[in-house]
Amino acid sequence: CKAMHVAQPAVVLASSRGIASFVCEYASPGKATEVRVTVLRQADSQVTEVCAATYMMGNELTFLDDSICTGTSSGNQVNLTIQGLRAMDTGLYICKVELMYPPPYYLGIGNGTQIYVIDPEPCPDSDF
C-alpha cells in the first residue's frame, strides 16, 4: 500500500481555436479495474469541476456528451483535451485520479497544469 503519484505538465498553451491538451499520468499502486479521472480548475483557492469520466481499465474513457473534455487512455496514462477555452479560462487545471474498484480506494492529485488561453485577434476588415 503506498500513496498514488499523479504527474502532469506544468504549463500548456491553448491553440488559437481554444483547445488545450495534456497528459495525466498516474503510478497505480494497485490493480484497479475502474478508474475515475476528473479535471478541476483552481482559482483563488476555489476549486470547481471542469469534467469527469469513469472508465474500466482497457476501455476508453467517456465524458458526458455535453462535456468540454475529451480523452483517451492507455495504461496508466490519460490524454486529456479541453475545448472551447477563452482567455478568461486561463488558470490552473488539476488532474485528479481515483482508483474506484476494487478496494482499497486510492486518490491521487496532480500539481496542476497552468493553461494559458489567448483569444485570437479579430480579422481586420480588408479593403479591395
Partner: antibody, heavy 118, light 108 residues
Framework: QVQLVESGGGVVQPGRSLRLSCAAS????????MHWVRQAPGKGLEWVAV????????HYADSVKGRATISRDNSKNTLYLQMNSLRAEDTAVYYC???????????WGQGTLVTVSS | EIVLTQSPGTLSLSPGERATLSCRAS???????LAWYQQKPGQAPRLLIY???SRATGIPDRFSGSGSGTDFTLTISRLEPEDFAVYYC?????????FGPGTKVDIK
C-alpha cells in the same frame, strides 16, 4: 450555503437496526463523495464509510463491514447509513461529512447520537 | 491501513505561545491527502488545513501546516483563547481513511 443535517439517531437495543439520514443542500450533491464519521463518547474520530458520486462504489471501515450499508439518493440530495446488528461499541455521535473535490472533509453536519443499550 | 500517531497527547500552553503538533504516518502519505481538523467540546470538527499545507477558507494565518512522506506538523504561531481544543490529523489518500488519536491543547 452548504448545509448537512443528520437525523435518525436515538436509543436502540443491541442486535437491532437503525437508519441514519443526512439531508444535504447548497451544493451539487452528485459531484462529491459523501462520508459518515463517528465519535464514541470521550474518544477520537473514526471514519465509517463513503459512497462515491453515483453511489455505485462504496467503502467501509473494518469495524462496520458486513453490518453497515451506506447509500445515497442523488434526486433527494440525501445520504443514508443503515446499521444492523448494533453493538454497545457502536454508541457514538455520527457525523455526515462532504468530501471536497480535492478529497478532504470540508463540511460537517451537527451529528446525531446513537446509543446502543439494553 | 495507514496508522496515524499524534504527539504529544496533551499540550499545555499559555495564550500567545507557539504550539507545534506532530502527526506521524505508519507509511508514506501523499502530501495532497493530509488534513488537520480542530474540534471543540460539543461541536463538529472544523477543517483547518488540507493538502498538508493549504489553509481552509476562513482559517486565520496563525495556523500553518507542513511536512511530507510520513511526518507532518501543524503550527499555531500565537495561541488565541479560542484555539484551545483538540486537533486531529487525517489521511484521505487510501481507504480506509484514518484519523490520528488527537492532540489536546489546553491552557496552562
Amino acid at each position: 450555503q452548504v448545509q448537512l443535517v443528520e437525523s435518525g439517531g436515538g436509543v436502540v437495543q443491541p442486535g437491532r437496526s437503525l437508519r441514519l439520514s443526512c439531508a444535504a443542500s447548497g451544493f451539487t450533491f452528485s459531484s462529491h463523495g459523501m462520508h459518515w464519521v463517528r465519535q464514541a463518547p470521550g474518544k477520537g474520530l473514526e471514519w465509517v464509510a463513503v459512497t462515491w458520486y453515483d453511489g455505485s462504489n462504496k467503502h467501509y471501515a473494518d469495524s462496520v463491514k458486513g453490518r453497515a450499508t451506506i447509500s445515497r439518493d442523488n434526486s433527494k440530495n440525501t445520504l443514508y447509513l443503515q446499521m444492523n446488528s448494533l453493538r454497545a461499541e457502536d454508541t457514538a455521535v455520527y457525523y455526515c461529512t462532504r468530501g471536497e473535490l480535492l478529497g478532504h472533509f470540508d463540511y460537517w453536519g451537527q451529528g446525531t447520537l446513537v446509543t446502543v443499550s439494553s | 491501513e495507514i496508522v496515524l500517531t499524534q504527539s504529544p497527547g496533551t499540550l499545555s500552553l499559555s495564550p500567545g505561545e507557539r504550539a507545534t503538533l506532530s502527526c506521524r504516518a505508519s507509511q508514506s502519505v501523499s502530501s495532497s491527502c493530509l488534513a488537520w481538523y480542530q474540534q471543540k467540546p460539543g461541536q463538529a470538527p472544523r477543517l483547518l488545513i488540507y493538502g498538508a499545507s493549504s489553509r481552509a477558507t476562513g482559517i486565520p494565518d496563525r495556523f500553518s501546516g507542513s511536512g511530507s512522506g510520513t511526518d507532518f506538523t501543524l503550527t499555531i504561531s500565537r495561541l488565541e483563547p479560542e484555539d484551545f481544543a483538540v486537533y486531529y490529523c487525517q489521511q484521505y489518500g487510501i481507504s480506509p481513511f484514518t484519523f490520528g488519536p488527537g492532540t489536546k491543547v489546553d491552557i496552562k
